[in-house]
Structures are given as C-alpha cells and as structure tokens.
C-alpha cells in the first residue's frame, strides 16, 4: 500500500541571529520536545494459537500500536495481502467487517485489534505452519503489516509468551524522511538545550517585525491533509509456509497467545508509484496505490480515511476505487 | 473513475439459466470484493453473496444458495453470477455493488417468462 | 437474520420543509469491540442504482450535502434531511452492516409535492 506524504521541512534558525536566541529558545525547544514525545513508530503485533479441541483451528489475534486512527484491517493467508495471499477478512471501522472461508468470525475487539477465528476442516483449512498476515491502514502512519505462525514446537491450546517481533512492512512514503526530520529535532533540542545552560537565560523582548527574526515551525498534518488520509480495515492473511523470523511482538495480548514469528517483508516504495493507482475507499475512491484511501470529504470520528484513512476510503470519486480490500 | 459496468438484460425461459456479468475500470480488481443485489420490480433489496477475487469461497446469502454461483475473472476484472432453475420469481433487475457497496453497477434486468 | 424496518413507508412534503425518515433493526447494530453502530443509508433515484449517502450511523459519504443527518443507535436509527430539495426525490434504504447477511429495509419513498 503506498500513499502520500507531504512533510515539511523543518527550518533550522538562521545563524547570527543571536539577538532573537531569547524568542528562539523559549518557542523552539517546546516544538521539538512535543515533537520527540509524540514521534513513535507505530508496531503492528499478531498472535496466533491453535485450538486444543479442534487441531485445525486456529484463533489469530492482530492489533496496531500508534497512536493514528486505523480505516482499515485486511487479514490473510499464503503471504501478505497484495502478494499471492488469500484473504480471510477485511474489516472497517465503521463499514463492518467482511470474511471469507476458512474464516469462521472476525471481529474487532477495541478500536485497535481484532481477532479471526479459522475453521479448521476442508481442503482450505489452515495447516500447522501456515503465515498469517495482519495488515493495518491508519492516518497518519500509513500501511503497516506484520505477519507470524505458530512457533513449531508450541503444543495445541498453548502458546509462547508474546515476544518482540518486528514490523513487516511500511508502506508509507516518506516514513522514513518523517524520522529523519524527528531525529533530527531531537538532536537539535538536545544541542540547545545543553547551549542553554551555559549561558544567561534571556530575557523576553517586545516581538520584532524585523524580517530577520527567526521563526520556528512546527510541523503537523494539514486538516485537508488529515482528511484525505483515512484508513478502514484490516486484513489477516495465512499460509502453509515456514516462518523465517523466530520473533513476535512484546506488547502482546495474555500469555496463552502464541506469538507468531514474523517475516520481514518491507517493500520501499517510491512516492511516484503510489500516487498513481486509485484506491477505492468506503463511498469513494482515492488516488492511493494498495489500499490507502485518499479522502476529500469528511471524516468518521475515530478513522482517518474511509473508514477514513488516507486519501479516503471515504474521498473524492476522482480519486476512485471502491472500499474493499488492500 | 471507478465504474462497473454490467451486461445487458435477459429474456429467458423457465427452468433455464442465466449468466451475468460485471466488469470493473478504474480501480484494482482484486483489491475489492464484489457483491450481488436482487432488487424485484417496485420492491426493496436483497442481499445475495460477495466474493473477493483472492478467495474462492464466496459467501451467500442462504436465501440464494442453489440458485446464484459467484465467480471471477482476475484477467479480464469481470465478476459474474450465475441464476440456475429460473422461475418468475428470478424476474429482477440485479445489480453489482464493490466494497462496501460504495460503487454501485448499472443493473441488469432478467425477465422470465415463457 | 436481522430484519430492517423502515417507516413511513412513504412521505409528501414541500421543498424547503424538514424530512424524518426511521429505520428500526430487530438486534442491535452496535459493534462492542469498538463501539460502532453498522448501519448505512442509500438514496435511489427514479431509473437509477442505490448510492451510498451514510455509513457507520453518521458519516456522509463524500459529496453528500449537509443537509443529510444520520443519528441514533443499537435498533434505532434516523435519517433527516433539514431542507428537502426537489433532487432529493428517491426511495431511500437503510442497511444493516453489523453481521451477514446484509439485509436492507423495505425503504421510505419521498416525494415533493
């Protein structure tokens, strides 16, 4: 899933403006700071644990940890979703959820995880080793997905204890260039922070109209921005295929859930791409390659785009694509 | 834009049956899952079943097990549904909607009578 | 299955007065895990498909004017138009979103007289 992101440039003060370093000191260091507390990657957990009762079936547990509103969970097996997996259920903030065989009941359990229960017989049934795929769509983060199976040695009905597994994938662009710019704050405020003990707290002055005086700007999302990003489902994906990271996810849910080691599968991908190829979203269509919505109308309470992620699940018809399943 | 655009109306006689289409532009076929809608002349809509293009196990409405059959053709992004056994109550206009029924198609109207 | 129920079935006012419209679910469309109502509402004009005007109880589809509200929750939900327009003339449906399969009410038909 690819969207846009826009992320202005933080200005660095212009040098030998010391005359200014009073304002400078006081507004910019707070910028930052927010900036640094607030900044945190967003992890996507999964958790999967084979029944005792039924040997074929299975219960995934998914959930997102960001502070973003999440438009969109897509769940699915035999690799992530958009890459040869079958998906299993798709569920939106406010459209409901949709699910398909093996899935038995998908539903969401907070506003940030939900839960796929499999069936465990016919040619479709799940296998012991299968990989099964969470991917989330949330505004302002983007697409993640995190895929895991079952540990090889877990017996039925237990499960390891949840362990940090990695995040599989960011689809956002220019996720990276966000962190970079975070970094960047953070190390600044630290630098000037230390400049600021060491010399005399300055003293407040009547604000200058001189051109010269430096303004600190703080970045945040545009509201227009914000509207056209919105997220609305999620999607669980599984398959038959050995998992290669022996990892999991440390905020897991109860002890008995076992963990599912993750596959690492970030596929960097460049702004043009993504822009191009319209993504349907929930009552309109976006101008977001895989899955993120780009929306122009409003948005729900708790989701970005439609259910409101990115250019909206809930957006413009000219960016169309009808809400479904990344 | 995102369009789906259904094939023409049907006559056909009883007993026999029938084979719609649906062909989605403007959007990734197989990131979306398509529905059915049966809409009888003058009355309200009935669900009938949904499929996703990466999953070949639609869902159907009980109602309509037996009579609909969902399928799909990633390569020419055409889902289809098939009416078998029809009867004067399979006169409908039918309709396919993707997602969340947010796109809605053109309707096709299937008429029975002998 | 849940059975949706609208009422009135059909309703006459002038442009310009204010339209309630009911729609009533034999179980509850509130989702508990994250305190969502499911249920959607579609206007269909003379000779064309349903489209899509609210979903999730309260949100406007992109585009729909203003002046359509959703409210309500568990089995009761409302659909208000604050100042009917000659365009608005349509059956509107509303539709349980919460759990398969998805059932549709037998809709409202509003006319403008």
């Known amino acids: 899933m690819r969207t846009e992101a826009q992320v202005p440039a933080l200005q660095p003060p212009e040098p030998g403006l010391e005359g200014a370093m009073g304002h400078r000191t006081l507004v910019l260091p707070w910028v930052l700071l927010t900036l640094c507390v607030t900044a945190g990657t967003p992890e996507v957990w999964v958790q999967v644990r084979m029944e005792a009762t039924e040997l074929s079936s299975f219960t995934i547990r998914c959930g997102f940890l960001g502070s973003g509103s999440i438009s969109l969970v897509t769940v699915s097996w035999g690799g992530p979703n958009g890459a040869g997996g079958t998906t299993l259920a798709v569920l939106h903030p406010e459209r409901g959820i949709r699910q398909w065989a093996p899935a038995r009941q998908a539903r969401w359990e907070t506003q940030s995880s939900i839960s796929l229960i499999l069936e465990g017989s016919g040619a479709s049934s799940p296998c012991a080793n299968t990989t099964f795929c969470c991917k989330f769509a949330s505004f302002p983060e983007g697409s993640w997905e995190a895929c895991g199976s079952l540990p090889p040695s877990s017996d039925p009905g237990l499960s390891a204890p949840p362990t940090p597994a990695p995040i599989l994938r960011a689809d956002l662009a220019g996720i990276l260039g966000v962190s970079g710019v975070l970094l960047f704050g953070c190390v600044y405020l630290l630098h000037l922070l230390r400049r600021h003990k060491h010399r005399p707290a300055p003293r407040l002055q009547p604000s200058r109209t001189s051109p010269q005086a430096p303004r600190a700007r703080a970045w945040a999302p545009s509201q227009a921005s914000q509207a056209a990003l919105h997220v609305p489902y999620a999607t669980i994906n599984t398959s038959c295929r050995p998992a290669t990271l022996d990892t999991a996810h440390p905020h897991g849910g109860p002890s008995w859930w076992a963990s599912l080691p993750t596959h690492a599968a970030h596929r960097p991908q460049g702004p043009a791409a993504w822009a191009s190829t319209p993504i349907p979203a929930r009552g309109s269509f976006v101008s977001v390659e895989n899955g993120l919505y780009a929306q122009a109308g409003e948005r729900p309470p708790h989701t970005g785009p439609g259910l409101t992620l990115f250019p909206d699940p809930r957006g413009p018809r000219a960016m169309e694509g009808p809400l479904g399943v990344r | 834009e995102v369009q789906l655009q259904q094939s023409g109306p049907e006559l056909v006689k009883p007993g026999a049956s029938v084979k719609i289409s649906c062909k989605a532009s403007?959007?990734?076929?197989?990131?979306?899952?398509m529905n059915w809608v049966k809409q009888s002349h003058g009355k309200s809509l009935e669900w009938i079943g949904d499929?996703?293009?990466?999953?070949?196990?639609?869902n159907y409405n009980q109602k309509f097990k037996g009579k609909a059959t969902l399928t799909v053709d990633k390569s020419s992004n055409t889902a289809y549904m098939e009416l078998r056994s029809l009867t004067s109550e399979d006169s409908a206009v039918y309709y396919c909607?993707?997602?969340?029924?947010?796109?809605w198609g053109t309707g096709t109207t299937v008429t029975v009578s002998s | 299955d849940i059975v949706m129920t609208q009422s009135p079935s059909s309703l006459s006012v002038s442009a310009g007065e204010k339209v309630t419209m009911s729609c009533k679910s034999s179980?509850?469309?509130?989702?508990?895990?994250?305190?969502?109502?499911?249920l959607a509402w579609y206007q269909q004009k003379p000779g064309q498909p349903p489209k899509l005007l609210i979903y999730?109880?309260?949100t406007r589809e992109s585009g729909v004017p203003d002046r359509f509200t959703g409210s309500g929750s568990g089995t009761d939900f409302t659909l208000t138009i604050s100042s009917v327009q000659a365009e608005d003339l349509a059956v509107y449906y509303c539709?349980?979103?919460?759990?398969?399969?998805?059932?549709f009410g037998g809709g409202t038909k509003l006319e403008i007289k």
């Open positions: 909607a993707s997602g969340y029924f947010d796109v």
């Open positions: 403007g959007y990734t076929f197989t990131d979306y899952f």
């Open positions: 499929i996703i293009p990466n999953n070949d196990s639609p």
């Open positions: 179980q509850s469309l509130l989702n508990s895990g994250n305190q969502k109502n499911f």
């Open positions: 999730g109880t309260s």
């Open positions: 539709q349980n979103d919460h759990s398969y399969p998805w059932t």
